[in-house]
């Protein structure tokens, strides 16, 4: 999916009202310095495909954040404001439901999603010169 | 304007089946989660799940041990809960609420279903 | 499963008095995940205020709402007689969601 065509400034909106306070949920406990930000982004597209990949494809480890609450804010802030995004998500989504663990937060996940928070402050902050 | 119409009034034998339909319009069907709520007579509210259209993701709520399907076809923009095995505690208004991000961006059941009363009777 | 616990049951007011409703949560939530919901006799429930304290579209300014971590409260500074209803707090911080068991705001 091309997230060119996004209202990012919405998206941005409901990530700072309430999806970032699930990803803090989520994380509570862990120090912010536990781990280091691999993954980074250019542009808010370019940032939005990153997050969409982390939050919803199951990766060696962590099969299992597409069922958190800040995946169900997320999905819906990018099908209401990115348009065509929900039609192209039918068979990513099947084929995960296929393959879908029981719901365990491991130490990859909370790696994952600490990734997820960087790529989120990443896309908050489009004018700043990549590191 | 969204709204949610809500199929009538059912009676049922228990043991048997259920199934509501939550018609919508006025909205992008596909784009927003479609929960389903209950409510026994003089009792509060309780979530049962909810479904996202766009690829028919769910998310169920465990009380009701598998006995809750929802479904949706995007064909009519209409979400479906099915209730299985039912028992006279489940006589209840049923309830479908689209689920959004209001004008503050709080994600919240900002439209409501207008109710389905199911009652449970030998 | 966050437990919401709605005090009082029953909250008997007369028209123009202060009426203070409480939500308490079993876990700490963020408070942009607390909504308050209105319902009348024989309706559906209705959005009344956003994240603790944002009001719905159309919602008198003598609602209030604030709180935080496990500690809410809706208030209605001045008690009209269309705000004679039963009102529910609901969570959005985590599966399964969850509602108080509803505060009736009744005639005095």
């Known amino acids: 999916y091309d997230f060119t065509n996004c209202d990012f400034e919405k998206i941005k909106a409901a990530y700072l009202s309430t999806i970032s306070k699930d990803l803090i949920t989520y994380m509570s406990g862990t120090k912010s310095t536990e781990f280091n930000n691999t993954v980074s982004c250019s542009n808010r597209p370019h940032c939005l495909t990153e997050i969409q990949s982390l939050t919803f494809n199951p990766t060696a480890g962590c099969a299992s954040l597409a069922k958190e609450m800040f995946a169900m804010k997320t999905k819906a802030a990018l099908a209401i404001w990115c348009p065509g995004y929900s039609e192209t998500q039918i068979n990513a989504t099947q084929a995960m439901k296929k393959r879908r663990k029981r719901k365990v937060t491991t130490n990859k996940c909370l790696e994952q999603v600490s990734q997820l928070q960087g790529l989120w402050r990443r896309f908050n902050r489009p004018l700043l010169k990549q590191q | 304007q969204v709204q949610l119409v809500q199929s009538g009034a059912e009676v049922k034998k228990p043991g048997s089946s259920v199934k509501v339909s939550c018609k919508s319009s006025g909205y992008a069907f596909s784009s927003y989660w479609i929960n389903w709520v209950r409510q026994a007579p003089g009792q509060g509210l309780e979530w049962m799940g909810q479904i996202f259209p766009g690829d028919g993701d769910t998310t169920y709520n465990g009380n009701f041990k598998g006995r809750v399907t929802i479904t949706a076809d995007k064909s009519t923009s209409t979400a479906y809960m099915e209730l299985s095995s039912l028992r006279s505690e489940d006589t209840a208004v049923y309830y479908c609420?689209?689920?959004?991000?209001?004008?503050?961006?709080?994600?919240?059941?900002?439209?409501w279903g207008q109710g389905t009363t199911v009652t449970v009777s030998s | 499963e966050i437990v919401m616990t709605q005090s009082p049951a029953t909250l008997s007011v007369s028209p123009g008095e202060r009426a203070t409703l409480s939500c308490s949560v079993s876990?700490?939530?963020?408070?942009?995940?607390l909504h308050w919901y209105q319902q009348k006799p024989g309706q559906s429930p209705r959005p009344w205020i956003f994240g603790t304290s944002n009001l719905a579209s159309g919602i008198p300014a003598r609602f209030s709402g604030s709180g935080s971590g496990t500690e809410f409260t809706l208030t209605i500074s001045s008690l009209q007689s269309e705000d004679f209803a039963v009102y529910y707090c609901q969570q959005w911080s985590s599966y399964p969601l969850t509602f108080g068991g509803g505060t009736k705001v009744e005639i005095k």
């Open positions: 609420a689209r689920s959004g991000f209001d004008y503050g961006y709080f994600y919240a059941m900002d439209y």
């Open positions: 876990s700490s939530i963020s408070s942009s995940n």
